[in-house]
Interface confidence: low
């Protein structure tokens, strides 16, 4: 029998390279059976994840899975960082793996920092 637990299908260490000024949709793939769970996005700030309450979000329903989408219209340089979605279902909180956005500011034409740079300069994630 198929499990009816809510599942969040963000892959571990997933990342996206995006341009400042472009629109972007960050998807949280959600699998559920009956009641759609309450899903939220948050942005990592150190060890805490700050809820993104005032950002535009929407649901996209596919046949076998749904997507809770965080809209960036447009992407801003300070959108750089790591995000996580979480689902509240039957009093359980299920958290996804984090997904990282690497925002390239077109004006400065800077390249995406390398993983080594990100490791040595973690504040880049929260700028």
């Amino acid at each position: 029998k198929e499990s009816c637990d809510v599942q969040l299908y963000i892959k571990r260490q997933s990342e996206h390279s995006i341009l400042a000024g472009d629109p972007f949709e960050l998807e949280c793939p959600v699998k559920y059976c009956a009641n759609r769970p309450h899903v939220t996005w948050c942005k990592l700030n150190g060890t805490t994840c700050v809820k993104l309450e005032d950002r535009q979000t929407s649901w996209k329903e596919e046949k076998n899975i749904s997507f809770f989408i965080l809209h960036f219209e447009p992407v801003l340089p300070n959108d750089n960082g790591s995000y996580r979605c979480s689902a509240n279902f039957q009093s359980n909180l299920i958290e996804s793996h984090s997904t990282t956005l690497y925002v390239t500011d077109v004006k400065s034409a800077s390249e995406r920092p390398s993983k080594d740079e990100m490791a040595s300069r973690p504040w880049l994630l929260y700028s």
């Epitope: 759609r36 309450h38 939220t40 309450e53 005032d54 950002r55 535009q56």
Partner: antibody, heavy 127, light 107 residues
Amino acid sequence: EVQLVESGGGVIRPGGSLRLSCAASGFTFDDYGMSWVRQAPGKGLEWVSGINWNGGSTGYAASVKGRFTISRDNAKNSLYLQMNSLRAEDSALYYCARDYYYGPGSPNYFYYAMDVWGQGTTVTVSS
Amino acid sequence: DIQMTQSPSSLSASVGDRVTITCRASQGISSWLAWYQQKPEKAPKSLIYAASSLQSGVPSRFSGSGSGTDFTLTISSLQPEDFATYYCQQYNSYPRTFGQGTKVEIK
């Protein structure tokens, strides 16, 4: 068990004030928006006011705007409705209800249905 | 504000009957409609959300359908505990608004 218990109702003269409280238990209070819904004797349901998880967004029915104030204290798992300048037409059974995100767009106070209700507290405005 | 109009306002039915209640929105609300059941002296109970999704724990004899402006709540085989007042509510736009209610009485 998920539970909402309202208190603070009573008999008050027109122009007076009352503060309703709603004590929540059995769920993570600050994961949810909350609403007040009222029902005048022998009448239907009327949404009065709503508030998001952290109090950053509030909304009011036109009939109470400027007179009622919704607030919450997440540390106390409590929701409040401060009612000023009360009128005879405010006489009703006031229900506290938990909001659940079932809808489109930004998760804000008006994109929710109500999934859990308290038993209500009665407000009578009479001279 | 969006006006929600339910019909009929009341109906009489017998145990085992199929009962249909309709709800019409004054403008399109996609599928963002909920149904609630309220028994005398009790708080409302959530039955259906998103027009057709059954709330957890609600018997399968309840079903909802519709989108846009026209919606239906159906009770496939009325049970004694189903005699109550039913309300629809839109949550597509601010402020949330309810229908006036449909009272289901025993014939």
